[in-house]
């Protein structure tokens, strides 16, 4: 597990404690909450980050309309169970033995049940739609400049392979970033779109997870891009299984981030 060797810190995750007692005498950084060693050369999994947080909280449009199966994270923060690799376990339960199934980004995808609830596999979220509204500016941003800047951001800051940024849509003041990554496309070492989206979400909220770096300063041709609202939709490879009542009202349960 690599880290900045000189002073033993974790550039990609400030919610860690680092010490020089890893394999081979190298610096080893452990995520708060779980104590799992993390690879500081890449993003830490969302599950470990959530656990750490809980231990230390129109017609002819170019914009995408989320499908009927799109999930929004309405349940807020919880202390998740992570597997030995730091991924979400398919079944999550709270202290009162209420259980539910989650997808690979940790968002609930079934009704809540009891300890008898079975979640056979961790269903992959293969499509993430990040819906942003920016603050008023003198004029609209140039679409191609905006597209290039957001792609650069995901490539350089979050180390997400460019092929996983499927599209950037813009219809002032709404920006939509589409991330797509099927199980078959994700190679060993590839950053997961769910992790990249979570880092981006925290950056946008002014809660950067990076060690010692300043907050996110998004600029398009020198003009600040200030986000005033974020909404993230998650689409799974297998549609979620909610009761009809939940499905009918699902899109009214938007989770806004200011």
């Amino acid at each position: 597990h690599t880290a900045a060797q000189d002073n033993c810190t974790c550039p990609t995750n400030k919610m860690t404690v680092c010490s020089p007692d890893g394999p081979g005498g190298r610096c080893q950084c452990r995520a708060l909450g779980s104590g799992m060693a993390v690879d500081c050369s890449t993003l830490t999994s969302k599950c470990l980050l959530l656990k750490a947080r809980m231990s230390a909280p129109k017609n002819a449009r170019t914009l995408v309309r989320p499908s009927e199966h799109a999930l929004v994270d309405n349940d807020g923060l919880y202390d998740p169970d992570c597997d030995p690799e730091g991924r979400f376990k398919a079944r999550q339960c709270n202290q009162t033995s209420v259980c539910w199934c989650v997808n690979s980004v940790g968002v609930r995808r079934t009704d809540k049940g009891d300890l008898s609830l079975r979640c056979d596999e961790l269903v992959r979220t293969h499509h993430i739609l990040i819906d942003l509204r920016h603050r008023p500016t003198a004029g609209a941003f140039n679409h191609s400049d905006l597209d290039a800047e957001l792609r650069r951001l995901f490539r350089e800051r979050y180390r997400l392979h460019p092929k996983f940024v499927a599209a950037v849509h813009y219809e002032q003041p709404t920006i939509q970033i589409e991330l797509r990554q099927n199980t078959s496309q994700k190679a060993a070492g590839d950053v997961d779109i769910g992790d990249a989206a979570y880092y981006f979400e925290r950056d946008i909220k002014g809660e950067s997870l990076f060690q010692g770096r300043g907050g996110l300063d998004l600029r398009v041709r020198g003009e600040p891009l200030q986000v005033e609202r974020t909404l993230i939709y998650y689409l799974d490879e297998i549609p979620p299984k909610f009761s009809m009542k939940r499905l009918t009202h699902h899109h009214h349960h938007h989770h806004h981030h200011h």
Epitope: V17, S19, D21, P23, Q28, G35, P84, E85
Partner: antibody, heavy 115, light 107 residues
């Protein structure tokens, strides 16, 4: 050379508290985890918890969370564990150890809980 | 929590023989396993870290192997001073846990 020196044996009554110290020398105290482990007579080793002296971040075994308190005084390179509401089954040798693989251990502190 | 199961509970061998001690983890822990020797009235002593890394001052007859869930401590040729209790411990995630120990006794 690295050394962890613990405080002396203690005899306590049930319901009382005990505080054991572990003085580190021969290395940078703030950069390594200090773990606390206990061993009841004739039994195996049991991890109580760990503290990172640099920022006093502490992690407890769930079993001890409500009764154990780990602290560290960086100025004198000493870690402490306090165990409250003692019971007879807390009778054990308490060890401090350094790093994730426990490369150096204190000599142990015998805590006897008896009425 | 991760459970470590050591086997056998007791191993009876003669000096000069080869000892093979096993430690099995309840889930994949990579190579985050460490081995200790403890003699009566003494603090445990680290023998092997991270499954197979040797420790300065520990005789070369002690070696470790394994990854994932199955780990082995091997003593190539037993010396009289090797008869003791051996523990494995993991540092994969909190809480850290120990195996219940293997007692190596003289046959």
């Amino acid at each position: 050379q690295v050394q962890l020196v613990q405080s002396g044996a203690e005899v306590k009554k049930p319901g009382a508290s005990v505080k054991v110290s572990c003085k580190a020398s021969g290395y940078s105290f703030t950069t390594h985890w200090i773990h606390w482990v206990r061993q009841a007579p004739g039994q195996g080793l049991e991890w109580i918890g760990t503290i990172f002296p640099s920022n006093a971040y502490a992690v407890y075994n769930q079993k001890f969370r409500d009764r154990a308190t780990m602290t560290a005084d960086r100025s004198i390179s000493t870690a402490y564990i306090e165990l409250s509401r003692l019971r007879s089954d807390d009778t054990a040798v308490y060890y401090c150890a350094r790093a994730s693989y426990f490369d150096y251990w204190g000599q142990g502190t015998t805590v006897t809980v008896s009425s | 929590e991760i459970v470590l199961t050591q086997s056998p509970a007791t191993l009876s061998l003669s000096p000069g023989e080869r000892a093979t001690l096993s430690c099995r983890a309840s889930q994949n822990i990579g190579t985050s396993i460490h081995w200790f020797q403890q003699k009566p009235g003494q603090s445990p002593r680290l023998l092997i870290k991270y499954a197979s890394e040797s420790i300065s001052g520990i005789p070369s007859r002690f070696s470790g192997s394994g990854s994932g869930t199955d780990f082995t401590l091997t003593i190539s040729s037993l010396e009289p001073e090797d008869f003791a209790v051996y523990y494995c411990q993991h540092s994969h995630s909190w809480p850290f846990t120990f195996g219940q120990g293997t007692k190596l006794e003289i046959k």
